[in-house]
Interface confidence: low
């Protein structure tokens, strides 16, 4: 068979643990555009939330902002909490890098983490009694 | 600056590009638990959304589910759209891995991608005319 050489621009796969271990460039490519969020949105959510800082130096990104619903009910047009409605968290699984072995500056392991991004409002379950 | 000695258990940082390039174990640590979402939630959101599949085989994760708000207004308790309220997207920046250089099997770069996770409801801006 013909040996197809790896492009000279590729790092050597001398790591005996390849494909389990790969090389990752931490210089982030930022293709995302900032979220457009008018500054007064947060005061106008019907299911508002606060953001809590979750910091872990053994993780990359080390800071994750976690949303926490401010109320169990939802805020109506008059600004009052309506307990007939419910504020519920919206969660998403994200990818982070965890230092492994711990405290090593150059060695990480992929980890999936569930984070709460915000809250939304749901109407209650209505059970019709026949 | 003081050079902080690496723990003896850490892999050698022979990569001349350290700290930009690090070694990553792809065996995912999955500490997260699946989001608990009762099956009937989606029918009860006041700002419902649909999920669109965003697929890119050159990225990890290759499939990202993007939320798209179903209405411009919000759904009231009677199940009708209320145009005095607005459904707005909740966005989050996530990390993905992209092959770089493109043709290398063992070399990746972190990339930030903005995704829409769900939608929430906001009350309109009320301008008081004096």
């Amino acid at each position: 068979g013909i040996m197809i050489p790896q492009s000279p621009g590729c790092p050597k796969t001398e790591d005996k643990n390849f494909p389990q271990h790969v090389r990752v460039n931490l210089n982030i490519l930022n293709r995302s555009t900032p979220a457009r969020r008018p500054s007064d949105y947060s005061k106008r959510f019907t299911s508002p939330w606060t953001l809590q800082r979750n910091e872990d130096p053994e993780r990359y990104s080390s800071v994750i902002w976690e949303a926490k619903c401010s109320h169990s009910g939802c805020i109506n047009a008059e600004g009052k909490e309506d307990h007939h409605m419910n504020s519920v968290p919206i969660q998403q699984e994200i990818l982070v890098l965890r230092r492994e072995p711990r405290h090593c500056p150059n060695s990480f392991r992929l980890e999936k983490v569930m984070v709460t991004v915000g809250c939304t409002c749901v109407t209650p379950i209505v059970r019709h009694i026949s | 600056g003081i050079m902080i000695p690496q723990s003896p258990g850490c892999p050698k940082t022979e990569d001349k590009n350290f700290p930009q390039h690090v070694r990553v174990n792809l065996n995912i640590l999955n500490r997260s638990t699946p989001a608990r979402r009762p099956s009937d939630y989606s029918k009860r959101f006041t700002s419902p959304w649909t999920l669109q599949r965003n697929e890119d085989p050159e990225r990890y994760s290759s499939v990202i589910w993007e939320a798209k708000c179903s209405h411009s207004g919000c759904i009231n308790a009677e199940g009708k759209e209320d145009h005095h309220m607005n459904s707005v997207p909740i966005q989050q920046e996530i990390l993905v891995l992209r092959r770089e250089p493109r043709h290398c099997p063992n070399s990746f770069r972190l990339e930030k991608v903005m995704v829409t996770v769900g939608c929430t409801c906001v009350t309109p801006i009320v301008r008081h005319i004096s």
């Epitope: 197809i4 390849f18 494909p19 389990q20 | 792809l26 065996n27 085989p57 050159e58 990890y60």
Partner: nanobody, 119 residues
């Protein structure tokens, strides 16, 4: 429904050759990198080779470089592995896999085909 069906395995003497085939269906074959993965008796899974969507680029684990060749025919939705100069340590069940760009992540694979290298 995604289906991957391997064939072509068998018993071969050291130094011999085999050609494995994989018939794919249920997805857009030409949009995905494809892989061969193997599992030797009593061992874990080992990534063997990968071929990019258009067949222009191939990668191999060091132990098979120069002996194995991965190829594909997008018109036939088929993946191949030409195995030459076979050694006893190549004895394994070989799986064809569709996957993510990360070399460990395969979302689908076939039932496998057994390759035994023995005199």
């Amino acid at each position: 429904e995604v289906q991957l069906v391997e064939s072509g395995g068998g018993l071969v003497q050291p130094g011999g050759s085999l050609r494995l085939s994989c018939a794919a269906s249920g997805f857009t074959f030409s949009s995905y990198s494809m892989y061969w993965v193997r599992q030797a008796p009593g061992k874990g899974l080992e990534w063997v080779a990968e071929i990019k969507q258009d067949g222009s680029e191939q990668y191999y684990v060091d132990s098979v470089k120069g002996r194995f060749t991965i190829s594909r025919d997008n018109a036939k939705n088929s993946l191949y592995l030409q195995m030459n100069s076979l050694r006893a340590e190549d004895t394994a069940v070989y799986y064809c896999a569709k996957g993510e760009i990360l070399p460990l992540y395969f979302d689908y694979w076939g039932q496998g085909t057994l390759v035994t290298v023995s005199s």
